[in-house]
Amino acid sequence: MGCDRNCGLIAGAVIGAVLAVFGGILMPVGDMLIEKTIKREVVLEEGTTAFKNWVKTGTTVYRQFWIFDVQNPDDVAKNSSKIKVKQRGPYTYRVRYLAKENITQDPEDHTVSFVQPNGAIFEPSLSVGTEDDNFTVLNLAVAAAPHIYQNSFVQVVLNSLIKKSKSSMFQTRSLKELLWGYKDPFLSLVPYPISTTVGVFYPYNDTVDGVYKVFNGKDNISKVAIIESYKGKRNLSYWPSYCDMINGTDAASFPPFVEKSRTLRFFSSDICRSIYAVFGSEIDLKGIPVYRFVLPANAFASPLQNPDNHCFCTEKVISNNCTSYGVLDIGKCKEGKPVYISLPHFLHASPDVSEPIEGLHPNEDEHRTYLDVEPITGFTLQFAKRLQVNILVKPARKIEALKNLKRPYIVPILWLNETGTIGDEKAEMFKTQVTGKIKLLGMVEMALLGIGVVMFVAFMISYCACKSKNGK
């Protein structure tokens, strides 16, 4: 009888020990299985979870626009006063709803190439007005022409055309015209076959971004989605030195197993450069734990503050010998037009940039860019890309519309907020397929280990107690 009890207790302890060992073994084995599954599923090839979502994003992406309506156009043109602006918006468009096209796998170098078609659909229900709402904004052609043609002879010619077309420093345009293009009356007078359509995003609809060639991750998962080349080149030809490199992914996803210490590098064709994001905080997105990576102020700093940025300063006059910060001259990428990119309301920009503009209210929460990345898969499940489009306008002695200006202005035209968040259905699916399974496996591991240890300890204590009792 005593033997039976002892044997039972030892058997219980052994079972507990086996369960604990099995739970312990399951930890690295389970992690290995998860890793193997993740590595298989994030590869960009037909049949994987990643590929399906990569071809056509399952996230609804909106681009909201706020237009800077100029309140004192005549005063600025006549007296070179501060420009008073009032933002109007949001005007919302649905974007990135089109699937990638011309998808071609290259098994030789483990890459996949594609183009991303552009399209925008106005969403009246998410907007404060219609596409026909009018705004007073800088005259894009009048501001750009003397910048492109800096020679005084041509400026006299341009002045004749500007006067003839009754154009001035500012103009009134509808949202649709401003964003997507309008026939400019001044450019229409140029007696050569030039493009006379002007718009901040012209041309956009029915155009494509790319060709992109990205690593599919088949041979090396740590390279998945990283851009190998853009438009057939590994460099942009816009910037000197390393600033010209195409680094990282397109920000839609990153190689899996993202650590907080990692700097996420990505290329954005909108700003004609590669940039980076650093870990900000851990957040819960619809029950999915994600890492929020933010664009640091350092990325927009002057070379004085961040020497790495020296090659993004390509012009010495407007940048006050590279001491100004928070604006990026992307003219080289925009056919020589004086386009400057910044954060909305000149967030993180030097005071000299925003000084000539009244009515700006930079706000970190509203105006910063962030990416919410699920760390195991590297998928960006939520993002907010915020940027502002500005045009440089300078005094031009030979152009009457600009001759009264006493200083250059970097004039804000609009700012945009492009956002995407994983849908509820997709989030549930993601939880079930990825985080749910990992949680479940973790729970099983912990349960086996816990139950095993408890069983082993309990049965061993009982056995010892029993033995000492019998001994007495």
Epitope: N151, F153, V157, N159, K163, L189
Partner: antibody, heavy 117, light 107 residues
């Protein structure tokens, strides 16, 4: 086809006047503006005057300022160079030429102006 | 006014030769330089604008280079019809100014 035809040249006494015409076809002078360029016998080219597009400003070489006047009649698509107080050094072949960005892509055949007593 | 100094003022060459004519501006004119060819008794003909841009219909043996103050017209292989006088011109500032010309003669 773009064509420029000058006329009005001839022999004139020092201190005299002459009006040169430049009839354009194949384009509108209003959109381009017109220049006059001259070439003294055996010498190089010298820019003389310019009328900017759409009846814009007029510009002259220092050597002719105050004596020569450039004008255009858009209805006739013709440019003119009114030359007063002519001097011996104004003797040259006068060309009218079309330009927009400052280089001359079309030239007339030229008309000879001789200033001599 | 911007002075344009051409050199040489004349040169002798044979058919098939490579010929180079230079032009120097008295101040920076960026790439706003044109080149013309003129034959006796005829109006000048545009060869090159914006320092390097070959005008339509001009044979590809003609090429232009340079930026700022120093410019060059090159004829890669001289043809019989190329014997003429060549002028550079700046189209950066009014008054527009020409070089004094380079006469290319048969050796």
């Amino acid at each position: 086809e773009v064509q420029l035809v000058e006329s009005g040249g001839g022999l004139v006494q020092p201190g005299g006047s002459l009006r040169l015409s430049c009839a354009a076809s194949g384009f509108t002078i209003d959109a381009f503006g017109i220049h006059w360029v001259r070439q003294a016998p055996g010498k190089g080219l010298e820019w003389v005057a310019w009328i900017a597009p759409y009846g814009g400003e007029t510009y002259y070489a220092d050597s002719v300022k105050g004596r020569f006047t450039i004008s255009a009649d858009t209805s006739k698509n013709t440019a003119y160079l009114q030359m007063n107080s002519l001097r011996a050094e104004d003797t040259a072949v006068y060309y009218c030429a079309r330009s927009f960005f400052g280089y001359f892509d079309y030239w007339g055949q030229g008309t000879l102006v001789t200033v001599s007593s | 006014d911007i002075q344009m100094t051409q050199s040489p003022s004349s040169l002798s060459a044979s058919v098939g030769d490579r010929v180079t004519i230079t032009c120097r501006a008295s101040q920076d004119v960026s790439n706003w330089v044109a080149w013309y060819q003129q034959k006796p008794g005829k109006a000048p003909k545009l060869l090159i604008s914006y320092a390097t841009s070959l005008y339509s219909g001009v044979p590809s043996r003609f090429s232009g280079s340079g930026s700022g103050t120093d410019f060059t017209l090159t004829i890669s292989s001289l043809q019989p019809e190329d014997f003429a006088t060549y002028y550079c011109q700046q189209h950066s500032n009014a008054p527009l100014t020409f070089g004094q010309g380079t006469k290319v003669e048969i050796k």
